[in-house]
């Protein structure tokens, strides 16, 4: 055959699936890899064909379209299980060629089992609320495409175990879930289980995200720089380590990049020619606030080194703020021997 | 049974200020509720002023046009809902109904019968 | 704020016959629309939430549909009590939406 622009295998779109429950996988093709649909690609005569790996072989072979009840179809480029089977588990190929053209791509499709809390090797989507932010809402994803508009599905919103009924702060409605306010006691994974019927059959969507209650940007700050500051004076001798903590507080605020570093002398640390460490360690709160320490450290420090400027700087969405830590050479305790002397002077 | 009761409304000179309350009865405040204001010219339809959570952390909506101008606050102890207006114009003139929404797609339920307030010299 | 045109202003139909007011919300709200129905000297009171749902007490005759930004609220079989002022209100409270209702549509009952 001729030659075949093969993407390979798109580990990038590790499809899971579960057990027992309808699936509709689109050809990756045109959705990340060429410039046009499949409308354009079927009207220009180009013919999409489909094939997969079995789980641990090496064999292409044919997808079985003529399964009972058209368990596995194909319709325009979305390949259809009704429902999926846990031996389904495989790499599957998609290739849309003519005479004269060849394009295909492969990826992996899991299908994975879940236990009667909806507990599986499923990697969930994380969806932040703002803490105490008045009404927010979740939506059962990944659901469209399934059944026409006209169908009505029954919505059953589950948190762990629990079906979701006569909750204090939270309200199911349809397909969305609704938070009146949100509190860290909210922090959890949420499933909606999707039923609707389908030519004299009754089919199970479920989805399951974890929500993860967040700092509120009603109560977001700048950064706060917590050391150094004014109380603390680092007061060495030449030859000793000098330690400086640089600590910030972070507000959770979504989207932000947070960032502490230091300046000596108005430099950053790696522009100048002293023998200087920087070692960063981040801790969070419930609500995922954020604090950085970054220790500057410089294992023998030199008198020049203790009349250098050391600036402590941090950056957010919300501002930047910088703090000059307080470095001063130690002052040698008066030598007793010589003050005596002075004292025991000739009159 | 639960009960809504806005008072406070009348007579209020133009560029005055006023402050409406609304007394909830029967139900806790300290539920999770949003109470909501909502006022009608005579003759005209409803348009909606704010809401505010009643529980123990401090959250309001207000319509665009009415922030800096209408504040919303409430007290959970004493089960009341405070609508404060200030800079009044005739274009204020209005029965102001308080109503109440939890569940149900947000929808206002529960609604008391409403207070008059005129602007007028 | 969101916007919500409701049409017609005013409609006039006779006892047994049906009315259909529309509601069009300046960007989707899902669901979260609710049809109120007011008196003269009284609150309004809630018939549909959720754009479809009826609520506790109100009569099969009243049906609410659609989702996003078209909705409608029907009323068969009218009577002589339907004779009211009809509001739409957004219900999808959020920092950009609020809870705007309709400008109205008056229902004579002939």
């Known amino acids: 055959s001729e030659r075949c622009d093969d993407w390979g295998l798109d580990t990038m779109r590790q499809i899971q699936v579960f057990e027992d429950e309808p699936a509709r996988i689109k050809c990756p093709l045109f959705e990340h890899f060429l410039k046009f649909n499949y409308s354009t690609a079927h009207s220009a005569g180009l013919t999409l064909i489909w094939y997969w790996t079995r789980q641990d072989r090496d064999l292409e072979e044919p997808i079985n379209f003529r399964l009972p009840e058209n368990r596995i179809s194909k319709e325009k480029d979305v390949l259809w299980f009704r429902p999926t089977l846990l031996n389904d588990t495989g790499n599957y190929t998609c290739m849309l060629r003519n005479t004269t053209y060849c394009s295909k791509v492969a990826f992996p499709l899991e299908v994975v089992q879940k236990d009667s809390c909806f507990n599986s090797p499923m990697k969930l989507p994380v969806h932040k609320l703002y803490i105490e932010y008045g009404i927010q809402r979740i939506t059962c994803p990944n659901v469209d495409g399934y059944f026409p508009s006209s169908v009505k599905p029954t919505i059953t919103w589950y948190m762990g175990c629990y079906k979701i009924q006569n909750f204090n702060n939270v309200i199911p409605e349809g397909m969305n879930l609704s938070f009146l306010i949100a509190l860290i006691s909210n922090n959890g994974n949420y499933t909606c289980v999707v039923t609707y019927p389908e030519n004299g059959r009754t089919f199970h969507l479920t989805r399951t995200l974890t929500v993860k209650v967040v700092g509120s940007p009603k109560n977001a700050v700048p950064p706060v720089i917590h050391s150094p500051n004014d109380h603390v004076v680092y007061e060495k001798e030449p030859g000793e380590e000098l330690l400086i903590p640089c600590t910030v507080y972070f507000s959770f605020l979504m989207d932000s990049r947070n960032e502490v570093w230091w300046t000596i002398d108005g430099k950053k640390p790696d522009d100048i020619t002293i023998d200087v460490t920087i070692n960063e360690s981040i801790s969070h709160s419930r609500t995922e606030d954020e604090t950085r320490t970054q220790i500057l450290s410089i294992k023998k420090v030199t008198s020049e080194d203790l009349k250098r400027s050391y600036v402590c700087h941090a950056r957010s969405a919300k501002g930047e703020v910088a703090k000059a830590a307080k470095v001063k050479q130690k002052v040698p305790a008066p030598r007793y021997t010589v003050e005596l002397a002075c004292g025991f002077g000739a009159t | 049974q639960e009960q809504l009761v806005e008072s406070g409304g009348g007579l209020v000179q133009p560029e005055g200020s006023l402050t409406l309350t609304c007394t909830a009865s029967?139900?806790?405040?300290?539920?999770?509720?949003?109470m909501c204001w909502v006022r009608q010219a005579p003759g005209k339809g409803l348009e909606w002023i704010g809401c505010?959570?009643?529980?123990?952390?401090?959250?309001?909506y207000y319509a665009n046009w009415a922030k800096g101008r209408l504040s919303i606050s409430r007290s959970t102890s004493l089960s009341t809902v405070t609508l404060q207006m200030t800079s009044l114009t005739a274009a204020d003139t209005a029965t102001y109904f308080c109503?109440?929404?939890?569940?149900?797609?947000?929808?206002?339920?529960?609604w008391g019968p409403g207070t008059l307030v005129t602007v007028s010299s | 704020d969101v916007v919500m045109t409701q049409t017609p202003a005013s409609v006039s139909e006779p006892v047994g016959g049906t009315v259909t007011i529309k509601c069009q919300a300046s960007?989707?709200?899902?669901?979260?629309l609710s049809w109120y129905q007011q008196k003269p000297g009284q609150p309004p009171k809630l018939l549909i939430y959720?754009?479809?749902n009826l609520a506790s007490g109100v009569p099969s005759r009243f049906k609410g549909s659609g989702s996003g930004t078209e909705f409608t609220l029907t009323i068969s079989d009218l009577e002589s009590a339907d004779a009211a002022t009809y509001y739409c209100?957004?219900?999808?409270?959020?920092?950009?939406?609020?809870?705007?209702f309709g400008g109205g549509t008056e229902v004579v009952v002939k």
């Open positions: 209100q957004c219900t999808y409270y959020d920092n950009n939406y609020g809870g705007a």
């Open positions: 109503a109440r929404f939890r569940d149900d797609y947000a929808s206002l339920k529960l």
């Open positions: 029967g139900f806790s405040f300290s539920s999770i509720y949003y």
């Open positions: 960007q989707s709200i899902s669901s979260y």
């Open positions: 505010i959570y009643t529980g123990n952390s401090d959250f309001t």
């Open positions: 959720g754009a479809s």
